[in-house]
C-alpha cells in the first residue's frame, strides 16, 4: 500500500506581549508527545500589532478590539481550525501597564478588562490577561534563551546549534531592554544573593538554579529618555533645550504636560515658566553619555556592590544574551557582530551622533523620523547602561551576544512564560525519551 501522511500530532500556543510601545503576538508549535523535552517548542509566527502599547488606550478603550483584530485573525489562519479550541492564549502586559497601574489601578483594570473581552471573542482557549511582574519578565526571558540554547538539556552534543553556543551547560545571562523597563538575570558564581527580592530558585530538568534578577522600572529606553529630558529641562535657561543626544540640526517641540505624564519623571517635576520647549540637537556622544549617567545614582549602596539606585548586583558571570531593544537598536547601528569591541562601538556611536540630521534622514529614507531621531540616544543609553549601570568592561563586553532570534524563535519572555503556564518545563529530568512520532505508515 502507498505510504500516507498521518495528521501532524502537534500543539499550538499563543502569547501576546503587551509592551509599553507596542504589542506583539507570538505563535508557538510543538510535537504533542514531546512536551517535556527541552528545545522542542518553536515559534512559527510573530505578528506585530499596528499602533502603540495598550496603556495608551486609556482614553479610547473602545478601539482595543479593532487594534487586536489583524494579529488575532492571522493566528486563526496560521493555526489549523481543528486546533483552535485547544490552543491557549495568554496576554502578559509589562512595564507600560505597571506604570499605568501605579497612576491608577482603575484605569489599568479598565484596559485589561476590555482586552480580555476582546480576546474572549476568538475561538481559542483564552487563559487571561495580566500584568506580569518585573521579576517574572526577567525570569521568563532567562528561561527562554537558555531553553532555546539547549542549556537545560542533560545530553551534551558534539555539535553547536547556534554560533555562540558553547557546549558546556553553563547558562547564559539575560539582558532585556524594553521601552519602559530593563531586566538583568543570571546565575552568579558561588555568590550569595544579598537581597531576597532579587533571588529566584528554580529546579528545571533535575537541576537547581539560583538566579539573580532585577527589573529596573523607568529604565527602558523610552522612559529613560523622558527622565533625561525632565532632568535637563530643569536647568534650561529658556524654552530651548540644546540636547547632545540628538543629531545636529534636529528640532522637536515637546509639551511639558507630556513630559510629566509618566511617574518616571516625578522626581524631576517642577513648575516651568513655559508649556512647551524645543529640543535642538547638537549631536555629541560624550556629552550625551554624561547626561545619561546622571540618571544612575551610584552614590548609595547598602550591599557589597550595586548596579545603581541602591540595587544589589552580584559580580557578572558568564555569557549574556542581550535581546529586545538591546538587539534592535544595535542591529540598526550595525553593531551586533561578535567581532566589534566596546571601544569600536563607542567610536561608531561618536560618529553616528555627530552626523547631521538631514544626512541621517537621507541615509535612512525608509525609517520613520520618530524612531530614526532616537537611535543616537538609544545607542548611547545602551552603552551607558551596560558599562556604568551593569558594570560590564571593555574585556567582558565580548561576553555580550546581541541576539534577535535563536533557532528561529525570538529571544524574550514570552516563550518562557508559555512553557511555564503550560507546565512544559519539568522540575525533574524525564525518565525516558518518548519514541519519536513516525510520520508515515
Amino acid at each position: 500500500t502507498q505510504n500516507k501522511a498521518l495528521p501532524e500530532n502537534v500543539k499550538y500556543g499563543i502569547v501576546l506581549d503587551a509592551g509599553s510601545s507596542h504589542t506583539s503576538l507570538y505563535i508557538y508549535k510543538w510535537p504533542a508527545e514531546k512536551e517535556n523535552d527541552t528545545g522542542v517548542v518553536h515559534q512559527v509566527e510573530e505578528c506585530r500589532v499596528k499602533g502603540p502599547g495598550i496603556s495608551k488606550f486609556v482614553q479610547k478603550v473602545n478601539e482595543i478590539g479593532i487594534y487586536l483584530t489583524d494579529c488575532m485573525e492571522r493566528a486563526r489562519e496560521v493555526i489549523p481550525r481543528s486546533q483552535h479550541q485547544e490552543t491557549p492564549v495568554y496576554l502578559g502586559a509589562t512595564a507600560g501597564m505597571r506604570l499605568l497601574r501605579m497612576e491608577s489601578e482603575e484605569l489599568a483594570d479598565r484596559v485589561l478588562d476590555v482586552v480580555e473581552r476582546s480576546l474572549s471573542n476568538y475561538p481559542f482557549d483564552f487563559q487571561g490577561a495580566r500584568i506580569i511582574t518585573g521579576q517574572e519578565e526577567g525570569a521568563y526571558g532567562w528561561i527562554t534563551i537558555n531553553y532555546l540554547l539547549g542549556k537545560f538539556s542533560q545530553k551534551t552534543r558534539w555539535f553547536s546549534i547556534v554560533p555562540y553556543e558553547t557546549n558546556n551547560q553553563e547558562t547564559f545571562g539575560a539582558l532585556d531592554l524594553g521601552g519602559a523597563s530593563t531586566q538583568v538575570t543570571f546565575v552568579p558564581q558561588n555568590q550569595t544573593i544579598e537581597s531576597p527580592d532579587n533571588a529566584l530558585q528554580f529546579r528545571l530538568y533535575g537541576k537547581d538554579y539560583n538566579v539573580y534578577t532585577h527589573s529596573f522600572l523607568c529604565y527602558g529606553k523610552d522612559q529613560a529618555l523622558w527622565q533625561k529630558l525632565a532632568k535637563d529641562i530643569q536647568v534650561a535657561s529658556n524654552e530651548i533645550l540644546r540636547d547632545p543626544c540628538f543629531h545636529p540640526g534636529y528640532k522637536k517641540v515637546v509639551n511639558v504636560s507630556d513630559l510629566y505624564k509618566t511617574p518616571c519623571t516625578k522626581r524631576f517635576e517642577m513648575t516651568l515658566p513655559f508649556q512647551q520647549f524645543e529640543i535642538q540637537g547638537i549631536g555629541n556622544y560624550q556629552q550625551c553619555h554624561q547626561s545619561i549617567l546622571e540618571l544612575f545614582n551610584t552614590s548609595y549602596c547598602p550591599y557589597s556592590q550595586c548596579a545603581f539606585n541602591g540595587i544589589f548586583l552580584p559580580p557578572l558571570q558568564g555569557d549574556f544574551g542581550a535581546f529586545s531593544a538591546f538587539y534592535f537598536v544595535m542591529k540598526f547601528l550595525n553593531l551586533t557582530s561578535e567581532k566589534v569591541s566596546q571601544e569600536k562601538v563607542t567610536e561608531m556611536m561618536k560618529k553616528f551622533c555627530a552626523q547631521p540630521w538631514e544626512e541621517i534622514k537621507t541615509s535612512y529614507p525608509a525609517v520613520a523620523a520618530k524612531y530614526l531621531s532616537e537611535y543616537c540616544f538609544s545607542g548611547t543609553y545602551i552603552l551607558s547602561l551596560l558599562l556604568q549601570g551593569y558594570h560590564f568592561t571593555a574585556d567582558s563586553w565580548e561576553h555580550i551576544h546581541f541576539i534577535g532570534k535563536i533557532q528561529g524563535s525570538d529571544a524574550g519572555w514570552t516563550l518562557g512564560y508559555m512553557l511555564n503556564l503550560t507546565n512544559m518545563i519539568p522540575a525533574e529530568q524525564p525518565l525516558s525519551t518518548p519514541l519519536s512520532h513516525s510520520t508515515y505508515v
Epitope: 478603550v61 505597571r98 491608577s104 511617574p263 518616571c264 519623571t265 522626581r267 517635576e269
Partner: antibody, heavy 116, light 111 residues
C-alpha cells in the same frame, strides 16, 4: 500577602518634629505609590500626599506642603513621613496606604500626641 | 478642591433592613469612563477597610450585601441585609484629582 507595618505611638512637644515609618511586604515595593492620611478625632480623614518609591518623587496636599516630608528606603522597603513644627492640631492617627488611586491596603496607623 | 458631602451623619437601621448612605461631590469624579469614587468601612481602633472601588466594584473579600452605585457627582452605598457586624463608620473618597478628599463620614448603628 500585602502588609504595611507602621511604627509605634509618639508623644512629642509642640514645635518639635516626628518621623514615622511604614514597612511594606508582600509585593514589589517600587510598583505602587505610598499615600499618607491623617485622621483626627476618629472621624475626619485628610489626605496628606504620596511618594513614588521608584524615584522618591512626591505630591502633597497644599495644606501639608512645606511641613511634611516623604521619603523611602527601597532596600528596606520602608516609607517615612516626617512632620515638622507640630501643634496640638497635629495630634491624630497617621496611616500609610498603598495605591495609585485605590487605597486597598492600609497600615495599622501611628498615633501622634502633641502635648507640652 | 473636590468637596464630598456625605449624608446622613448618623444612621440607625434594624437587622435585616437596608442602610443607604449617600455621597455628593462638588464636581464630577468621572474620568476616562471610570468613577474615581470609593467607600470605606472603619471600626474603632482599626484602619479604614476598602469596600467599594470605582463606584460599584466590590473590594477583595467584601460580602455581596455591600453595593455601590452612582456616577458623576451622586453616589450611594447600600447595605442589605444589615448585620450586627456592619456597625461602623463609613467614608466615601474621591481620587479623581489631587488633593484626594474624603467625605465627613456616616456612623451606622443597629436600631
Amino acid at each position: 500577602e500585602v502588609q504595611l507595618q507602621q511604627s509605634g505611638p509618639e508623644l512629642v512637644k509642640p514645635g518639635a518634629s516626628v518621623k514615622m515609618s511604614c514597612k511594606a511586604s508582600g509585593y514589589t515595593f517600587t510598583d505602587y505609590n505610598m499615600h499618607w492620611v491623617k485622621q483626627s478625632h476618629g472621624r475626619t480623614l485628610e489626605w496628606i500626599g504620596y511618594i513614588v518609591p521608584l524615584n522618591g518623587g512626591s505630591t502633597f496636599n497644599q495644606k501639608f506642603k512645606g511641613r511634611a516630608t516623604l521619603t523611602v528606603n527601597t532596600s528596606s522597603r520602608t516609607a517615612y513621613m516626617e512632620l515638622r513644627s507640630l501643634t496640638s492640631e497635629d495630634s491624630a492617627a497617621y496611616y500609610c496606604a498603598r495605591g495609585g488611586t485605590r487605597f486597598a491596603y492600609w497600615g495599622q496607623g501611628t498615633l501622634v500626641t502633641v502635648s507640652a | 478642591d473636590i468637596v464630598l458631602t456625605q449624608s446622613p451623619a448618623s444612621l440607625a437601621v434594624s437587622l435585616g433592613q437596608r442602610a443607604t448612605i449617600s455621597c455628593r461631590a462638588s464636581e464630577s469624579v468621572d474620568n476616562f469612563g471610570v468613577s474615581f469614587m470609593y467607600w470605606f468601612q472603619q471600626k474603632p481602633g482599626q484602619p479604614p477597610n476598602l469596600l467599594i472601588y470605582g463606584a460599584s466594584n466590590q473590594g477583595s473579600g467584601v460580602p455581596a450585601r455591600f453595593r455601590g452605585s452612582g456616577s458623576g457627582t451622586d453616589f450611594s452605598l447600600n447595605i442589605h441585609p444589615m448585620e450586627a457586624d456592619d456597625t461602623a463608620m463609613y467614608f466615601c473618597q474621591q481620587t479623581k484629582e489631587v488633593p484626594y478628599t474624603f467625605g465627613g463620614g456616616t456612623k451606622l448603628e443597629i436600631k
